[in-house]
């Protein structure tokens, strides 16, 4: 049914005809996400009519149908202005049961109505800056947070929980004031950590899950994204003991997430959100990643369970295959691994053994090849300085921040970017916090050491002198040509 | 009959081993000597790399050393405002407030009479009023059309602090200073068993013998280029844009017979300035044939290719390209949340409509 016909039916006002028109429109457009310009004015007119009814109150019998039509039109950018008003948003919030209320509604809300309203709000907040502002002013986050806190007590359908969390994600992603409010006033980290535990269905002492079901995966990912939004600009501050305990507890849940698989093919996505959030934990709380007790089948190194570190390394390997969105794919996991390595000697030694094993192949440049080391060295000259920096920093820490060792494994040419940035091109401070770390040379390396070009990091035969056979005068003449060039350059 | 060695034989074997070891160590010592040539145009960020070494490495500049830069800071500040005022005439830009013309005249008088390392309150007041003028700001915004230090705005915006009688330059102030480097500055440093000699080559033609020893057996050339130079208009005495000038020299050096097997470390500096500029000044100013978008990623990659493609010995000669932002020491301390904004944006992008 065309929007004009629906709008005409609405204006005549006969209830059954209106409902039938809306139903027909909904059926036809349930999967429409782009709209024809030719009917834009008709859709805008229909949107205005829907809004006027919405603001006066929808009849209980047909609320879901009306809200479905609103949801479809809220996908159309040209209709956003009609829906993004204070009254419309308030009406939708009331139907979603997230308006600040003087009295709790005595009867349980209709879940279908609640769900449709939440979907409308998600569409509006995603697409309309005005709706974002109005939603923040209406403090929708308060009742959303309250409802998240109720998941333990009352059973809400998966979809309601998912859209609650999605709306929370959108509000915190798009509004810094809401982010702050959820983080501070509304105890967001505790609230969502609690929700995450409930969703994962684990207590931190238990063994990791095998596979997280599809719905739980969806909800967990939304929770992880909201937690990311509210912690990324907050946890850079020092945390007190009470907060540190909370973040450590969150860390134990994230440890579970890293070790768990997700249903379908969503494991990497799930791990991605987990790793992003790990990067926001206060550094002193990352020790929980190495706190898993040893059990049969776990990977032990220097008496420490390395399962989580190993899982993160495997995740990094997977992510390095991608070319698209490289920065956000690899920087978080590299950051987490770097900090673990920086603070924990066993983690550093384990990672070094995996990533920078003692050098054997000294005939190939460090950036050539398919080993993890080669891929990371390649990133050290990446166009994106953030990518370059995290890759270089990771390898530098694995070298115990020893410049000679760093050059040995990566070559001075590749290392120059980090060294220049840190003011270490001409050496550096004496080795500090890592002095106890030894580096072992293989027989192959020792044999070839004298022939290794420190700049390229590989064995190179001494090149013939290009000036061989020239007289001093000729050499001087050539040199002066260069000098003239440099003179030009430095003017 | 046993195969035991006599005492003399044993001693002879030991002596022979020792000689071999010493020969090998001598060979290693020679092989482990790394000779670096540091090259770059006037404001390529070359000297900043050297200064940066000093700042983060060791404990930075001492207060005494910082004090010695006071005169340079003042000179840079005064030269910058003078360059802008002169350019106003050339670009036919009027002062926003006509009264500033008197200040401009006064500036030349006071600047000429200024004692090195001192800035009078009167001179500071004149500079401050001029810098605030809308005409001066308009001219500053067109600085790509004349020669102006990158640090101009940094010092002029901070004039209140700099003009204090008890002013001592900060590490960041020192990093921003601009002094013409001449001749060769040789730096030696050692990484464990690697002995580095870095020759910072200025443009002065000092004695020839010195140059020859400089060019022989170079392991790597560090070549600095300011990415942000791409849109600078030619000065009257220039034949080509500074970026093209750098490329021409890079070509000559990269393919010069002295440096047949010499690796090149190419520093494309001032990426922060470039990132800002590229939003407003298209890359076609420098490369008319460029057909890509004016995003940092695409434009920077194009410049990188322009330089790397000049290498005629791709199979034997390595070019290591690094994009850097030399003046920001904070930028180089490890940033844990380098990507948070991008993550949120992408998480939003992945959110569909319902």
């Amino acid at each position: 049914m065309e929007p004009r016909a629906v709008a005409d039916a609405l204006e005549t006002g006969e209830e059954d005809a209106v409902t039938e028109a809306l139903r027909s429109f909904n059926r036809e457009h349930s999967q429409s996400f782009t709209f024809d310009d030719a009917q834009q004015e008709d859709r805008k007119r229909l949107a205005k009519l829907l809004v006027s009814v919405l603001e006066q109150g929808l009849s209980p019998k047909h609320r879901v149908t009306w809200l479905q039509t609103i949801r479809i039109l809220s996908r159309d950018r040209s209709c956003l202005d009609s829906f993004a008003s204070r009254q419309s948003l308030h009406a939708l919030a009331c139907y979603a049961d997230i308006a600040i209320s003087e009295e709790p509604i005595p009867q349980p809300p209709d879940m279908d109505v609640l769900l449709e309203s939440l979907k409308c709000l998600c569409n509006l907040v995603l697409s309309s800056p005005t709706a974002q502002m109005l939603a923040a002013e209406a403090r929708l986050v308060v009742r959303l947070a309250e409802r998240v806190g109720l998941y333990r007590k009352r059973s809400y359908p998966h979809e309601v929980q998912f859209f609650d969390l999605r709306l929370l994600f959108l509000l915190t992603a798009l509004r810094t004031d809401v982010r702050q409010q959820l983080f501070q006033e509304l105890h967001g980290v505790r609230l969502l950590t609690d929700a995450l535990e409930l969703t994962l269905g684990v207590a931190p002492k238990e063994n990791p899950l095998v596979i997280l079901p599809a719905q739980e995966t969806e909800r967990a990912m939304e929770i992880l994204k909201v937690l990311f939004n509210i912690t990324y600009d907050s946890v850079k501050r020092e945390v007190d003991e009470e907060d540190a305990a909370l973040y450590r507890y969150l860390g134990t849940l994230l440890r579970h997430c890293v070790m768990a698989d997700a249903a379908g093919d969503r494991t990497e996505e799930f791990h991605g959100h987990t790793v992003n959030l790990l990067g926001n934990l206060p550094l002193k709380c990352l020790d929980v990643l190495l706190a898993l007790e040893l059990h049969e089948g776990s990977l032990e190194f220097m008496g420490v369970n390395m399962d989580v570190i190993n899982a993160l390394l495997a995740f990094l390997e997977k992510r390095l295959h991608q070319t698209h969105r490289l920065k956000e794919c690899v920087a978080p996991v590299l950051s987490v691994l770097t900090e673990c390595a920086r603070m924990h000697r066993p983690a550093r030694k384990f990672l070094k053994a995996q990533v920078l094993p003692p050098l054997r192949d000294v005939r190939t440049r460090p950036e050539v090849g398919d080993l993890l080391r080669n891929k990371l060295v390649r990133l050290m000259t990446h166009l994106d300085t953030d990518v370059k920096r995290v890759a270089a920093e990771f390898l530098f820490v694995l070298c115990s921040e020893s410049v000679p060792r760093f050059i040995k494994y990566t070559g001075y040419g590749n290392a120059a970017g980090l060294l220049a940035a840190r003011g270490l091109m001409a050496g550096g401070r004496p080795e500090g916090q890592y002095s106890e770390d030894e580096d072992t040379d293989t027989e192959e390396y020792r044999e070839a050491k004298a022939s290794i070009n420190p700049v390229t990091g590989r064995v190179e035969e001494k090149p013939p002198n290009p000036m061989e056979g020239m007289t001093e005068e000729q050499k001087e003449h050539e040199a002066m040509k260069l000098v003239n060039m440099f003179d030009k350059l430095s003017r | 009959m046993g195969c035991t060695l006599s005492a003399e034989d044993k001693a002879a074997v030991e002596r022979s081993k020792m000689i071999d070891r010493n020969l090998r160590e001598d060979g290693e010592k020679a092989a482990r000597e790394v000779k670096l040539l540091l090259l770059g145009a006037g404001e390529s960020g070359k000297s900043t790399i050297v200064k940066q070494m000093k700042i983060i490495h060791e404990a930075g500049y001492s207060e005494e050393e910082c004090k010695q830069y006071k005169a340079v800071v003042y000179s840079n500040t005064i030269q910058s405002i003078i360059a802008i005022i002169r350019a106003m005439g050339r670009l036919k830009i009027d002062f926003g407030d006509a009264a500033r013309a008197d200040d401009a005249r006064q500036l030349f008088v006071l600047a000429g009479a200024a004692e090195e390392g001192f800035m009078t309150a009167e001179l500071a007041g004149v500079i401050k009023r001029l810098w605030k003028d809308s005409g001066v700001q308009a001219c500053f915004n067109r600085s790509r059309e004349y020669q102006l230090n990158d640090s101009a705005a940094y010092y002029l915006n901070d004039l209140d602090r700099i003009a204090q009688p008890n002013y001592i330059p900060t590490q960041q102030d020192v990093l921003r200073t601009r002094v013409k480097t001449t001749g060769i500055v040789e730096t030696h440093f050692t990484f464990k068993d690697l002995h580095f000699k870095m020759f910072d080559v200025g443009g002065q033609r000092s004695e020839r013998k010195k140059w020859i020893h400089c060019f022989e057996g170079v392991t790597a050339i560090i070549f600095c280029v300011a990415l942000s130079d791409y849109d600078l208009v030619l000065a009257e005495d220039e034949e080509m844009n500074r970026m093209h000038e750098s490329m021409k020299l890079f070509d000559s050096i990269c393919n010069n017979k002295w440096f047949t097997d010499t690796s090149i470390i190419l520093f494309l500096n001032k990426k922060d300035l470039f990132e800002e500029k590229i939003k407003k000044s298209p890359l076609t100013i420098c490369y008319p044939e460029y057909a890509g978008s004016n995003t940092y990623e695409e434009a920077a990659a194009y410049i990188q290719c322009q330089f790397e493609d000049l290498n005629k010995r791709k199979d034997t000669k390595e070019i290591y390209t690094h994009f850097t932002c030399a003046t920001d020491t904070k930028n180089v301390q490890f940033v844990f949340d380098a990507v948070t904004d991008v993550i949120i944006k992408n998480n939003l992008k992945d959110c569909g409509l319902f």
Epitope: E103, G149, L150, L191 | -
Partner: nanobody
């Protein structure tokens, strides 16, 4: 020992206003629902008003609707009761109470509340 301390009670004329405050001794209370109850001599304890942990949901007893307002300031771990248009029948001892469950949204029933203050007397003379 967790404490709830009420203040602000006193003797007022009918039609006057009064503001009660209740401050908790621990930060965790900012995650609990809190309420005000009252008990007049010889009567049952009744709910005056309650507020969820985040302040998004409020409950009022029928007799005070439109006259009393409950609010909270989680940064100060304090809950307030603003009483306007007071009547002699509002005379009672007013108790502050808290539910000891994290992220609780509150309730009309006294049995749901785990912590109680000592009470503050409010007397409204005609």
């Amino acid at each position: 020992q967790v404490q709830l301390v009420e203040s602000g009670g006193g003797l007022v004329q009918a039609g006057d206003s009064l503001r009660l405050s209740c401050t908790a001794s621990e930060r965790a209370f900012s995650r609990y629902a809190m309420g005000w109850f009252r008990q007049a001599p010889g009567k049952e304890r009744e709910l005056v008003a309650a507020v969820s942990w985040a302040g998004g949901t409020t409950y009022y007893g029928d007799s005070v609707k439109g006259r009393f307002t409950i609010s909270r300031d989680n940064a100060k771990i304090t809950v307030y009761l603003q009483m306007n248009s007071l009547k002699p029948e509002d005379t009672a001892v007013y108790y502050c109470a808290a539910e000891a469950r994290e992220f609780s949204v509150g309730s009309y029933y006294a049995t749901e509340y785990d912590y109680w203050g000592q009470g503050t007397q409010v007397t409204v003379s005609s």
